[in-house]
């Protein structure tokens, strides 16, 4: 069990495109036909103006046009829903594909894809029916951009909603070596395959993946829930051939300075094919990016039954020490480190800024708005709202609610 | 304020190996890495590796062979070292930094004022 | 690796002239692009990261826009500081890759 770990099967709720809580100053666009088709009528359901958002431009062959709704602060985006141009029933308007960027901090942007590197979603094929898209992997995103396509010059015209919830433990990026491949009798590839940072070399960094994405793997690490993936893919791996300092050191960056009472940490310890938990870990703690680390280092060593197969989460205390970098260097306890998921328990530091100090030029309006003094069940289970149920089978399925 | 300082020789000879020293102030290792580039009339800027701040290393294919990269964190030096250097290696030397964090991620910032290398007999 | 083809190698300017410099990736880099400056006997000054965002202290008059393989870079109001070589970078992935330079020059 990860405690104060995420439920992505409960992270489906309206965001507030379609219920107007997300307002027309966060719904903008690279251009619109007209003042009738502007971006603030791109809401899902919604008969406003001439129906939907439509770009001035051709979005053949360029694909340059988007529709972007700023979600003012971070969330998990489970899913998105499409639909055309209403017009009075009458809009013929639709975007039969379409592509997704997304950012945390609106200065890097990255394209979504699915787990194979698909990025083109399938889209409407008429003006009316609502396409939701179950979005595997997920993304932590601030913003997000509609990108429409189309296979030749016509018109397109949209309508969105986004779907998820808030990002709570407010992870920005971790920092990671290359997750490596095991050699079995088939190869198992323990690459964080969704990490949508920078790779450069034996490092990832800048971004998030697998170890932040809610699915915990399973007891046999070349399993996984997820249909039509490798072998290993739910596990980010590391052996310790590869590291002479015997551990691996990761680094976690937050939105803003917190208060860490624990580290979860949902490792797998099949220790007959050489995956074992860590033999302890140490974590350091620091407030800014160019700040030197604070205080002693906090130690946990990690006893317990290792010779139980199963996969589990380990919970490190991390003594409510105030950060917002994390550096936690994992012991190996046998040949290979395997994790699913890593997560933390925390509090927002009240009056915290996410731009602490002068220690770093500003981003162009970073960071985002101030947390609420508390988080109340509204901002995580809508009033009145039922989150949308998950498809059976593939969790990349397109389905109508027409 | 951040400085990156460079020091190493202007002449190396055909075979030799060339090392230069980038002394860091002003910020810490962590959550930075040092790359390396150069400059040359003919090949414009190469990139040629860089070091983590967690001492992980990585290195241009075309240089692997011959370039090590090293660090001691506690004096704030990162150690550039490139064997069998030829006059085709005749350049100018940079080292440069760049965050791993996203609220402090600029690209490379800040560089060393440079190493002008001249491999002559 | 990537390759970053930069056009044009040479412009000649006026003071006050609109200025458009272009890199092509020879693959996606996402919006993964730094411009730098460069002055005679300096070490390269960032101007541009993530395509599109100025850094600290940088005049307004510098630009960038693009993503995936086609990136621009261009100065609005060209004035004789500027006079310099200028280059295109991706760090998307390893190894980072710079484009070949654009040199402005006087007319």
């Known amino acids: 069990d990860m405690k104060g770990h995420f439920d992505p099967a409960k992270c489906r709720y309206a965001l507030g495109m379609q219920d107007r809580t997300i307002p027309d100053s966060d719904i903008s666009a690279s251009s619109s036909w007209s003042d009738s088709t502007a971006a603030r009528h791109s809401r899902l359901e919604s008969s406003d103006g001439d129906g939907a958002w439509c770009p001035a431009g051709s979005v053949f062959p360029k694909e340059e046009e988007y529709l972007q709704v700023d979600l003012q602060r971070l969330h998990l985006v489970a899913l998105v829903g499409t639909q055309g141009r209403h017009a009075g029933g009458l809009g013929k308007e639709f975007s039969r594909s379409y592509r997704l960027r997304y950012s945390r901090d609106g200065r890097r942007w990255m394209g979504w894809k699915d787990r194979w590197g698909q990025e083109v979603i399938s889209g409407n094929e008429d003006p009316e029916g609502v396409v939701l898209k179950d979005l595997g992997p997920p993304m932590v995103a601030r913003l997000v951009r509609f990108y429409p396509r189309a296979d030749r010059v016509m018109s397109v015209c949209l309508r969105v909603e986004l779907y998820g919830c808030l990002w709570r433990d407010g992870l920005l990026s971790y920092t990671a070596p290359v997750g490596q491949t095991m050699y079995l009798s088939e190869a198992v590839y323990l690459n964080d395959s969704t990490y949508d940072g920078h790779t450069v070399g034996g490092l990832q960094y800048g971004g998030l993946g697998q170890l932040a994405d809610g699915v915990v793997g399973l007891d046999d690490f070349r399993k996984s829930q997820e249909l039509r993936v490798w072998p290993g893919y739910d596990y980010v791996g590391w052996s310790n051939h590869s590291f002479s300092s015997g551990y691996v050191e990761m680094e976690f960056e937050f939105d803003r300075l917190r208060a860490f009472q624990a580290m979860q940490v949902h490792c797998n310890n099949m220790h007959t094919l050489g995956a074992r938990l860590p033999g302890g870990v140490e974590c350091r703690f620091r407030r800014g990016p160019a700040m030197a680390w604070e205080g002693e280092p906090m130690r946990h060593n990690l006893g317990g039954n290792l010779g139980d197969p199963r996969a589990r989460a380990v919970s490190v205390p991390l003594g409510g020490r105030v950060a917002r970098f994390l550096q936690c260097r994992f012991l190996f306890a046998g040949p290979w480190l395997l994790f699913s998921e890593i997560s933390f328990i925390s509090d927002v530091v009240n009056n915290s800024s996410p731009a602490l100090g002068g220690t770093f030029p500003p981003a162009p309006w970073w960071p985002p708005g101030p947390p609420p003094t508390n988080f109340s069940s509204l901002e995580l289970e809508p009033r009145g709202q039922q989150p949308v149920a998950k498809a059976e089978g593939s969790p990349t399925i397109e389905f109508r609610m027409d | 304020q951040v400085q990156l300082k460079q020091s190493g020789p202007g002449l190396v000879q055909p075979s030799q190996s060339l090392s230069i020293t980038c002394t860091v102030s002003g910020f810490s290792f962590t959550g930075y890495g040092i790359h390396w580039v150069r400059q040359s009339p003919g090949k414009g800027l190469e990139w040629l590796g860089v070091?983590?701040?967690?001492?992980?290393?990585d290195y241009n294919a075309a240089f692997i062979s011959r370039l090590s990269i090293s660090m001691d964190s506690s004096k704030g030096q990162v150690f550039f070292k490139m064997n069998s250097l030829q006059a085709n290696d005749t350049a100018i030397y940079y080292c440069?930094?760049?965050?791993?964090?996203?609220?402090?991620?600029?690209?490379?910032?800040?560089w060393g004022q440079g190493t002008s290398v001249t491999v002559s007999s | 690796s990537i390759v970053m083809t930069q056009t044009p190698k040479f412009l000649l300017v006026s003071a006050g002239d609109r200025v458009t410099i272009t890199c092509k990736a020879s693959q996606s880099v996402s919006n993964d692009v730094a411009w730098y400056q460069q002055k005679p006997g300096q070490s390269p000054k960032l101007l541009i990261y993530?395509?599109?965002n100025r850094y600290t202290g940088v005049p307004d008059r510098f630009t960038g826009s693009g993503y995936g393989t086609d990136f621009t870079f261009t100065i609005n109001t060209v004035q004789a500081e500027d006079l310099a070589v200028y280059f295109c970078?991706?760090?998307?992935?390893?190894?980072?890759?710079f484009g070949a330079g654009t040199k402005l020059e006087l007319k």
């Open positions: 070091i983590w701040s967690g001492g992980i290393t």
């Open positions: 440069a930094r760049r965050s791993t964090t996203v609220v402090a991620d600029y690209a490379m910032d800040y």
């Open positions: 993530y395509a599109s």
């Open positions: 970078q991706q760090d998307y992935t390893s190894p980072l890759t």
